[in-house]
């Protein structure tokens, strides 16, 4: 059984200065621990690389209402 | 952490309407998408209504389109459900949810919840 007491915590002390264009977007995820110095979304590129992002920026909120909206239509 | 108050619930008759909100504070209201969900008395909490960051796009359930509408505020930190044609099988506790994680209507991807405001539909 893991402690998840112990378990990691993955922070972003540094945030893209770069828009990232949706279509190379695979999904996200939000680090709200705050055992962080910042709130943060984590996306995946659909080359898996992460990359830090500020949730208070629109063009990250565009970019997490569209990878939303992909989860609830069938792909194909 | 984000803190969610839900109010505007009550007793209602069969046909009538209610205006539910959820006032947000804490993190940045405007980074999550936001959704209704619902539990009657010996039932599973079931997925209401869920509304896009920017607010441009709302999913609803079977259960309740055409009759409700969600819509947020992102300057007042608030979310709201306009309930119209209410029927007594839309008696149930009414939670608002902040979602964090990637998903759409599944409560699993919603990190933040209120404590639920009762609604009750009278025939």
């Known amino acids: 059984q893991p402690d998840a007491i112990n378990a990691p915590v993955t922070c972003c002390y540094n945030f893209t200065n770069r828009k990232i264009s949706v279509q190379r977007l695979a999904s996200y995820r939000r680090i709200t621990s705050s055992k962080c110095p910042k709130e943060a979304v984590i996306f995946k590129t659909i080359v898996a690389k992460e990359i830090c992002a500020d949730p208070k920026q629109k063009w990250v909120q565009d970019s997490m209402d569209h990878l939303d909206k992909q989860t609830q239509t069938p792909k194909t | 952490e984000v803190q969610l108050v839900e109010s505007g619930g009550g007793l209602v008759q069969a046909g009538g309407s209610l205006r539910l909100s959820c006032a947000a504070s804490g993190r940045t209201f405007s980074s999550y998408r936001m959704g209704w969900f619902r539990q009657a008395p010996e039932k599973e909490r079931e997925f209401v209504a869920v509304i896009t960051r920017s607010g441009s796009d709302q999913f609803y359930s079977n259960s309740v389109k055409g009759r409700f509408t969600i819509s947020r505020d992102n300057a007042k930190n608030t979310v709201y459900l306009q309930m119209n044609s209410l029927k007594p099988e839309d008696t149930a506790v009414y939670y608002c949810?902040?979602?964090?994680?990637?998903?759409?209507?599944?409560?699993?991807?919603?990190?933040?919840w209120g404590q639920g405001t009762q609604v009750t539909v009278s025939s």
């Open positions: 949810a902040a979602g964090a994680q990637i998903g759409w209507a599944e409560a699993s991807t919603y990190d933040y």
